[in-house]
Interface confidence: low
């Protein structure tokens, strides 16, 4: 392919040319390329207009290209470029106009590029820049140059892993000129030892991240004091597990935060055993969101009412015991992936709406009611990936719940009462892999608003799916995979008229039945993969609901034997619904194992008597049918011949064609023959058939009996149309009954031989007879019309006044 | 397959091979070398990743004397405010890091331990590297 050795990811759009030892920019990629990855190639030098071949580029990755010099206008033609990545290039020389022409650049990544100063970085004209990442460089001064006042769209500035030690008042002066800037600033992993008090006074930042910046507790305290006056939406402090950490840490560390205005606070990774971590947060009582990530909290008093937090997040922390939570204003609590404190203890959170307690290995003695959480406002509850949860209450006081997730926890007492009876507002329920054994038909009673139900990986009494969904009239998604199901009630899904997706995969069904799905008139996706389906339950399978768009029957145990031939044929008939048909393979018999079901032609062997009787029967029936068929048309055509025998032919030719070729018939055939000299009169069904008369009768009486000849317009559409083939077959009979009749074949377009062979007679006739081929060129058209007129004039008595036919006693006419 | 030796300790010998086509160079040092009876030390890694390390996780396939243990997924980088500083490393950026480790009180029986480490990162997820570690364990006492 033209783009090789690069990889085409999205045709004409995305190309991956990573690590191909290119020394220059490739020139064999399309002009339309938008995403280009040239990383890990030894390009070394970028001259002017290096990328003129790619005017549409939006993303350009030049990571680790050993680039040392970038000349003026290297990217000059890239006015659409939004992302430029230069990570890991040892840049020695950067021309002042290196980034000129990048009028749409939003993201510039210059990580590990030997950058020693922002002052000399020529990006002042990049007004559209939103993200500047200059981490892992040699920058010593935090002075933001004057040109930053042009970067009015800047949202992210990453200066982490540099050499910044001090921050002075003058360093941030430019930010005072940009009060509307919504800047997130990352200064992590800089060896800070001094922040001048007042440096951040009256400065607004969206986010400030300071992790692993201080080599002692005193330095940390002093620097935090230096942040006084800062207004920050989100402040992230902490350390990294794999970097040098402070020797000690105590409750005075964060005292300086009282002088900041903070909306959201996060402490990320802190591995110290503190007497009582709560004392650390005296200056953070009024933040709206408070997060602890990977913090050791061995001993903790209660998180109590005097905190005004609305969102509390405790993630990946180590606890001695489950904390006591009494927070009046808290609306969201995320307590996930924590260790220790395995038993859930009641909390008192009267305003709580969102509660995520997932992945803690917690056990609940009795779940769930308002008293567990001290709230009646809860809308979202996630208890997934926990330990044993014993259901002892049906969510009394928690009627507002809309989202409930228990997946991969071990639910007990689920089939003893209607657990969800009061949850009439619940929209989403996940009880997948919860060791639930459904033995009670009222398990889902009360869930009248439920739209999504996931219950994969559970089990049912006797592996039978009963009528447990009767109240779930609004359900749109149902997952019953991996439930060891073998049978289902024929009416199990009758009330689910809104259901769109049904997953029945990974069960133990041996047969398929369409009956249970008859009421699912919104069903779009049905997944029956990974079962043991061999055959159908009933002899006659009906159709699935007409809304169905995807049917997955992959990885089943299809029995490709004569016994199941009707089922296999039914599967073939569903071809347009089936997904991944190549993974639908025969399981038995052994000689057909692994063969694709849809490409299989089963020739069925039966005993000789049955074959003999069958063949004889078929022959007799066939002969009778053929005789009746021939006799019927013989009589009809004969009757017509007697009726019209003494009269004149009204038409010179009856035209048989597919309605999809009507444009050609109207614009070419009719125009040239009826308006030409001599004029021919054609019989056309859209114009000359009598309304209200049966089509077959019209074809015979109006078409054949009143026409001298028949013109057959052969095309792909013609061969695929049953009506056309029907008309053509009558034409054959007509030719057979009236030896002088002439059929003129016009081949309108090259017809695929395989398609033509399906109509054996037509194939033979076209092989034996000369036919006219339509060719849309000046010379071709001329020859075509001359030959067609000649064929139609044959047997025609012409006078300029009108068209006179020769009646039923036609003269001999050659077929062309 | 070329075998890369890591280190020898009093009760173990550790080496690895690549189990992917890419075989991008990675330098692994353990100091002191791991002793399976109890160990504390530093793991030093030098590596230039071919994709961002954001959302890095390992799939671990452990075999003990030809017996396969269930696949284990170890999430290293969640995607924001991660524990390790290398989680913010970008494609092509040098990762040069030291990680401390310690474990104690685990009794391992004599034999050959294999651990396939599949590192997966990024969005969309793709394989970063794949290494197969072989630990030959010869305990002094069982």
């Amino acid at each position: 392919e033209s783009w090789e050795p690069c990889v085409e990811v999205v045709p004409n759009i995305t190309y991956q040319c990573m690590e191909l030892n290119f020394y220059k920019i490739p020139d064999n990629l399309p002009f339309s390329t938008k995403n280009l990855d040239l990383s890990f190639n030894p390009l070394r030098h970028l001259g002017s207009y290096s990328f003129f071949s790619f005017p549409e580029l939006q993303v350009l990755d030049l990571s680790r290209c050993e680039i040392q010099t970038i000349e003026d206008g290297a990217y000059q033609s890239l006015s659409h470029l939004s992302t430029l990545i230069l990570t890991g290039n040892p840049i020695q020389s950067l021309a002042l106009g290196a980034f000129s022409g990048l009028s749409s650049l939003q993201k510039l990544v210059a990580v590990e590029t030997n950058l020693a100063s922002l002052e000399n970085f020529p990006i002042g004209h990049l007004k559209t820049l939103k993200e500047l990442n200059v981490a892992h460089n040699l920058i010593q001064s935090f002075k933001l140059p004057e040109y930053f006042s042009n970067l009015t769209n800047l949202e992210h500035l990453d200066l982490s892993s540099n050499k910044i030690q001090s921050i002075y008042c003058t360093d941030l002066r430019v930010l005072h000129q940009m009060p509307l800037l919504n800047l997130s600033l990352d200064l992590s992993l800089n060896p800070m030892n001094f922040i001048q008090p007042g440096a951040f006074k009256e400065i607004r930042l969206h986010k400030l991240t300071l992790r692993n910046n201080f080599d002692s507790l005193n330095v940390m305290k002093t620097c935090i004091q230096g942040l006084a006056g800062l207004e920050v939406h989100r402040l992230v402090l902490g350390e990294f597990r794999n970097e040098g950490n402070l020797e000690k840490f105590d409750k005075s560390a964060l005292e300086g935060l009282c002088n900041l205005t903070i909306e959201e606070f996060r402490l990320a990774y802190l591995d110290y055993y503190l007497d009582d971590i709560i004392d650390l947060f005296n200056c953070l009582t009024n933040v709206s969101s408070f997060s602890l990530v990977s913090v050791t909290i061995e001993r903790v008093k209660d998180f109590s009412y005097n905190f005004g937090w609305q969102h509390l997040e405790l993630v990946n922390c180590k606890f001695g015991q489950f904390p006591t939570l009494k927070l009046k204003s808290l609306k969201r609590l995320t307590f996930t992936s924590n260790k220790g404190g395995n038993a859930f203890s009641e909390v008192d959170l009267p305003s709580l709406e969102f509660l995520d307690l997932s992945r803690n290995g917690l056990s609940f003695k009795g779940c769930c009611s308002q008293s567990d959480f001290g709230t009646t406002s809860l809308k979202y509850l996630d208890l997934s990936f926990n330990g044993v949860i014993t259901m002892s209450s049906n969510f009394l006081g928690l009627e507002q719940l809309e989202h409930l997730d228990f997946q991969h926890s071990n639910l007990k007492q689920m089939s003893e009462f209607s657990v969800f009876l009061s949850l009439r507002n619940l929209i989403y329920l996940d009880i997948s892999h919860t060791h639930t054994r459904v033995a009670f038909n009222g398990i889902f009673n009360g869930l009248s608003s439920l739209e999504v139900l996931k219950m994969a990986g559970n089990s049912f009494q006797e592996n039978f799916l009963p009528d447990i969904f009767t109240e779930l009239r609004n359900l749109t998604f149902l997952d019953l995979s991996q439930c060891q199901l073998e049978q289902l009630s024929p009416t199990a899904f009758n009330s689910l008229s809104s259901l769109q997706v049904l997953n029945m995969s990974h069960n133990n069904f041996f047969s398929l039945d369409t009956f249970p799905y008859k009421c699912l008139n919104s069903l779009q996706v049905l997944d029956y993969s990974l079962n043991h389906i061999m055959t159908s339950k009933k002899q006659e399978l009906q159709h699935f609901p007409s809304s169905l768009a995807f049917l997955n029957l992959t990885q089943n145990d299809f029995a490709c034997t004569c016994e199941h031939q009707s089922f296999l044929q039914w599967i073939k008939d569903q071809r347009q619904l089936l997904v991944e048909v190549e993974r639908m393979e025969c399981a038995t018999p052994s000689d057909k194992q692994g063969m694709p079901v849809l490409s299989l032609n089963i020739t069925c062997q039966m005993n000789k008597t049955i074959i003999g009787v069958s063949v004889l029967s078929v022959l007799v029936v066939s002969v009778v049918a053929v005789l009746v068929y021939k006799f019927y048309f013989h009589l009809m055509l004969l009757a017509g011949c007697i009726k019209y025998g003494r009269g004149e032919n009204i038409y010179d030719a009856f035209v048989i064609y597919s309605s999809q070729d009507e444009d050609w018939v109207r614009n070419e055939l009719v125009k040239n023959l009826e308006e030409g000299v001599p004029p021919f009169q054609l019989c056309l069904h859209y114009r000359d058939f009598i309304p209200g008369v049966a089509i077959a009768a019209n074809i015979i009486h109006e078409g054949f009996h009143k026409s001298r000849k028949v013109i057959v317009v052969v095309s792909q559409h013609f061969i695929q149309s049953r009506w056309c083939i029907f008309e053509y077959e009558i034409a054959q009979t007509w030719q057979f009954l009236s030896s002088r009749a002439g059929i003129i074949f016009i081949v309108l377009q090259k017809v695929e031989k395989t398609l033509l062979r399906q109509q054996v007679e037509l194939y033979r006739l076209l092989s034996r007879n000369t036919y006219l081929e339509w060719e849309d060129s000046v010379l071709g058209r001329h020859i075509f019309w001359r030959r067609l007129r000649k064929a139609l004039l044959d047997g025609k008595s012409w006078n300029p006044e009108g068209t006179v036919g020769t009646g039923c006693n036609w003269q001999e006419a050659t077929s062309i | 397959q070329k075998q890369y030796w890591v280190c020898n300790s009093s009760d173990a010998s550790i080496s690895y091979t690549y189990c992917d086509k890419m075989q991008y160079p990675i330098s692994i040092n353990v100091n002191p070398c791991i002793e399976l009876k109890r160990s504390k030390g530093l793991l030093h890694i030098f590596y230039i990743p071919r994709r961002d390390l954001k959302q890095l996780y390992f799939n671990l396939y452990i075999t003990v004397n030809t017996m396969n243990l269930p696949k284990r997924k170890e999430v290293i980088c969640r995607g924001s405010d991660d524990d390790y500083s290398f989680c913010r490393a970008l494609k092509g950026e040098t990762v040069n890091t030291t990680i401390s480790f310690s474990f104690k009180g685990i009794k391992f029986s004599k034999g050959k331990y294999k651990c396939v480490v599949e590192a997966i990162s990024g969005s969309p997820e793709e394989m970063l590297f794949c290494l197969e570690f072989v630990i030959l364990h010869q305990p002094n006492s069982n």
């Epitope: 989403y428 609004n474 779009q524 995807f550 997904v579 | 969309p124």
Partner: antibody, heavy 120, light 106 residues
Amino acid sequence: QVQLQQSGADLVRPGALVKLSCTASGFNIKDSYIHWVKKRPEWGLEWIGWTDPENVNSIYDPRFQGKASITADTSSNTAFLQLTSLTSEDTAVYYCARGYNGVYYAMDYWGQGTTVTVSS
Amino acid sequence: QIVLTQSPSIMSASLGEEITLTCSASSSVIYMHWYQQKSGTSPKLLIYRTYNLASGVPSRFSGSGSGTFYSLTISSVEAEDAADYYCHQWSSFPYTFGGGTKLEIK
């Protein structure tokens, strides 16, 4: 942050076809549905269909069946809309939008729109 | 398919006024989403699932309704609320939008 970046405007001839792209950033398209919506001047919004990139499913409004084809490439986090046999009726702004969290949430983020003009 | 009819098709309101836009469905739907589209911009999610406010949407917007009748209320109209408003159902296939209500500020 979550963004959907659509391809630029297209001027196409009647009878031709056009393929629009929608590149997502800030989230993985495998975790959501990507919808396509049509907006003609002086008309309201018309839903064309959605794709579920994780399961490689696409569903269409019957009015657009045969006219539209929605696909996704999860490796580049991009969804595509291909329109065939274009007529003046297809002149419109086409938006892609994220349908969040499975089958029941609304379209919470939209692309900036791609203007398709069908003209000879 | 379910047809959503929005009324009025054009509405004029004064600053500070409370207004209600309605959307009726040809047959019952489970819930309704509402979108706002200002001139020359993409639509923006306003209300999801009948009454939930999308993030960043001012609290002056509220939604209600059930069955075949749904409404969007703006408690105190501001100049920036001038836009087209569309209701949208995603509970019955194919998913449909209303014809829209154009809100003009006097």
